[in-house]
C-alpha cells in the first residue's frame, strides 16, 4: 500500500530515486570486472516522514512507535522496492563472461 | 548473499530483531481493532557497518558509496528480511471479523 | 539461451527502402548496458557496422549510412528494427544483428541475405 | 574511421603446429584508463562469427585456452598454440575505441 507521495518536508527531500555515477574503483570491482568502466548507480535516498511512501503495514506501525519512542524506534528508512537489472561483464577463472544481476539498480523507492 | 553477522561495534550494536511492547492506542488502532490489546511488535533495530548483513548487491554498492561520499550516500538500513504474520480481530460494517496481515511483524532482518 | 534471428525480404529493388527486423530472446533490451547492434557483410569482404541501440533508447548510427538509417526498438516484443532507405546494388550483403554488452559483443544472428537487384 | 589491417589474408597449418595472425591498427587502441579496445573473432564455415578474445587479451570464456592475444597500442597478434580441425574459419580482428567500431579483412585459416 504506496501511500502519500506528497513531501512534507520540501520538493526532493524525501525518500526518491537519485542517481550516484561510480567507477569500477569507487565500487571496489576493479578486480573481477571488465565493463563497464563507470556506472549510473540509481539508489533511494531521502527522509521517510510519517506515512510517507509506507511500504506496507509495518512501515506505519513503525511511524507511530517513532512518534512515541523516538529513541528508541527509528523512522522508516528508504529502501528500494524494486530493481533494475543490470550486466557486468566480469573475469572468472574459465575466462571473460557476461552476467546479469537483478539486485543492483533501484528502480523504484519506498519507506520500510 | 548475507553476509557477515559479526558486529564490528558491540554485542547487539548491529542490526537485528527486536521487540517493542505496544498499545492499540500506540499504533493508533484503537478505532478499528478489537483485539489483541496489546502487540508485540517485532522490527528490524540497529546500524548496517560494512557488509554487515548485505541484502544483495545493491547494499554492498551503497556500503562502498557512503564510505567514498557520507554526505551523499547513506549507509545501509536495517530492515525485514522476512514477515511473520499477525491475526487482528477488527470492527467492520457488517460486524467483527478476522483479519490475516502478513506484512505487520518482522521475523527476520538485513541491511539494505 | 540466447537467439537473435534476422528477418525481411531477400531481393529488394534499387531506390527501394529495406526494413529488417531482429526477433530475439534470453535477454531483455531493459537491461543496464544491453544493446543490439546490425552488421553486415558484402560477399567476400569485411563486416561493416552499421547501427546500435542501447536499453535506454540511445542510437548510433554509422556516419558514413547516417542518412538513410534508422533503428527502433521494441522491449515488449523483444525486436528491433533496422529500416534502409534508397537501397543500392553496393548494399547486397548478408545482414547480422547482434547483442552487445557495453564492449562485449558475444552474440550474433545466422544472418540473412539481402540482394538488391533490379 | 580508424583502418584494421591484417596478415596474412590466408593460412594454411597442420593440425597439432601452432599459428600466428597479425592485426594493425591505423591509431593507438590503448585508452587513457590502460584498456586496449581489440578484439578477435572466428567465423567458422556457415555459421556466424563469435567472439574469442576481449580487450586484446582477456579468453572469453568457453574458448579453449589454445587461443590467446597479445600486443601493443597499433600491433596485435592472435595465437593458436596448437592448431585443430575446428579451427578452421576467418579470423577477424576488430575496434572499439572509436565508432564505428571497425574490423580487419580476415584471415583465412585452413589445415593442410
Known amino acids: 500500500a504506496r501511500n502519500g507521495d506528497h513531501c512534507p518536508l520540501g520538493p526532493g527531500r524525501c525518500c526518491r530515486l537519485h542517481t550516484v555515477r561510480a567507477s569500477l574503483e569507487d565500487l571496489g570491482w576493479a578486480d573481477w570486472v571488465l565493463s563497464p568502466r563507470e556506472v549510473q548507480v540509481t539508489m533511494c535516498i531521502g527522509a521517510c516522514p510519517s506515512q510517507f511512501r509506507a511500504a506496507n503495514m509495518h512501515a506505519q506501525i513503525k511511524t507511530s512507535l517513532h512518534r512515541l519512542k523516538p529513541d528508541t524506534v527509528p523512522a522508516p528508512c528508504c529502501v528500494p522496492a524494486s530493481y533494475n537489472p543490470m550486466v557486468l561483464i566480469q573475469k572468472t577463472d574459465t575466462g571473460v563472461s557476461l552476467q546479469t544481476y537483478d539486485d543492483l539498480l533501484a528502480k523504484d523507492c519506498h519507506c520500510i | 548473499a548475507r553476509n557477515g553477522d559479526h558486529c564490528p561495534l558491540g554485542p547487539g550494536r548491529c542490526c537485528r530483531l527486536h521487540t517493542v511492547r505496544a498499545s492499540l492506542e500506540d499504533l493508533g488502532w484503537a478505532d478499528w481493532v478489537l483485539s489483541p490489546r496489546e502487540v508485540q511488535v517485532t522490527m528490524c533495530i540497529g546500524a548496517c557497518p560494512s557488509q554487515f548483513r548485505a541484502a544483495n548487491m545493491h547494499a554492498q554498492i551503497k556500503t562502498s558509496l557512503h564510505r567514498l561520499k557520507p554526505d551523499t550516500v547513506p549507509a545501509p538500513c536495517c530492515v525485514p528480511a522476512s514477515y511473520n504474520p499477525m491475526v487482528l480481530i477488527q470492527k467492520t460494517d457488517t460486524g467483527v471479523s478476522l483479519q490475516t496481515y502478513d506484512d505487520l511483524l518482522a521475523k527476520d532482518c538485513h541491511c539494505i | 539461451q540466447i537467439t537473435l534471428k534476422e528477418s525481411g525480404p531477400t531481393l529488394v529493388k534499387p531506390t527501394q527502402t529495406l526494413t529488417l527486423t531482429c526477433t530475439f530472446s534470453?535477454?531483455?533490451?531493459?537491461?543496464?548496458?544491453?544493446?543490439v547492434g546490425w552488421i553486415r557483410q558484402p560477399p567476400g569482404k569485411a563486416l561493416e557496422w552499421l547501427a546500435h541501440?542501447?536499453?535506454?533508447?540511445?542510437?548510433y548510427y554509422n556516419t558514413a549510412l547516417k542518412s538513410r538509417l534508422t533503428i527502433t526498438k521494441d522491449t515488449s516484443k523483444n525486436q528491433v528494427v533496422l529500416t534502409m532507405t534508397n537501397m543500392d546494388p553496393v548494399d547486397t550483403a548478408t545482414y547480422y544483428c547482434?547483442?552487445?554488452?557495453?564492449?562485449?559483443?558475444?552474440?550474433w544472428g545466422q544472418g540473412t541475405l539481402v540482394t538488391v537487384s533490379s | 574511421d580508424i583502418v584494421m589491417t591484417q596478415t596474412p589474408l590466408s593460412l594454411s597449418v597442420t593440425p597439432g603446429q601452432p599459428a600466428s595472425i597479425s592485426c594493425k591498427s591505423s591509431?593507438?587502441?590503448?585508452?587513457?584508463?590502460?584498456?586496449?579496445?581489440l578484439y578477435w573473432y572466428l567465423q567458422k564455415p556457415g555459421q556466424s562469427p563469435q567472439l574469442l578474445i576481449y580487450q586484446m587479451s582477456n579468453l572469453v570464456s568457453g574458448v579453449p585456452d589454445r587461443f590467446s592475444g597479445s600486443g601493443s597500442g597499433t600491433d596485435f597478434t592472435l595465437k593458436i598454440s596448437r592448431v585443430e580441425a575446428e579451427d578452421v574459419g576467418v579470423y577477424y580482428c576488430a575496434q572499439n575505441l572509436e565508432l564505428p567500431p571497425t574490423f580487419g579483412q580476415g584471415t583465412k585459416l585452413e589445415i593442410k
Open positions: 541501440i542501447w536499453w535506454n533508447d540511445n542510437k
Open positions: 591509431k593507438s587502441l590503448l585508452h587513457s584508463e590502460g584498456i586496449t579496445y
Open positions: 534470453g535477454f531483455s533490451l531493459s537491461t543496464y548496458g544491453i544493446g
Open positions: 547482434a547483442r552487445l554488452a557495453y564492449d562485449y559483443v558475444d552474440s
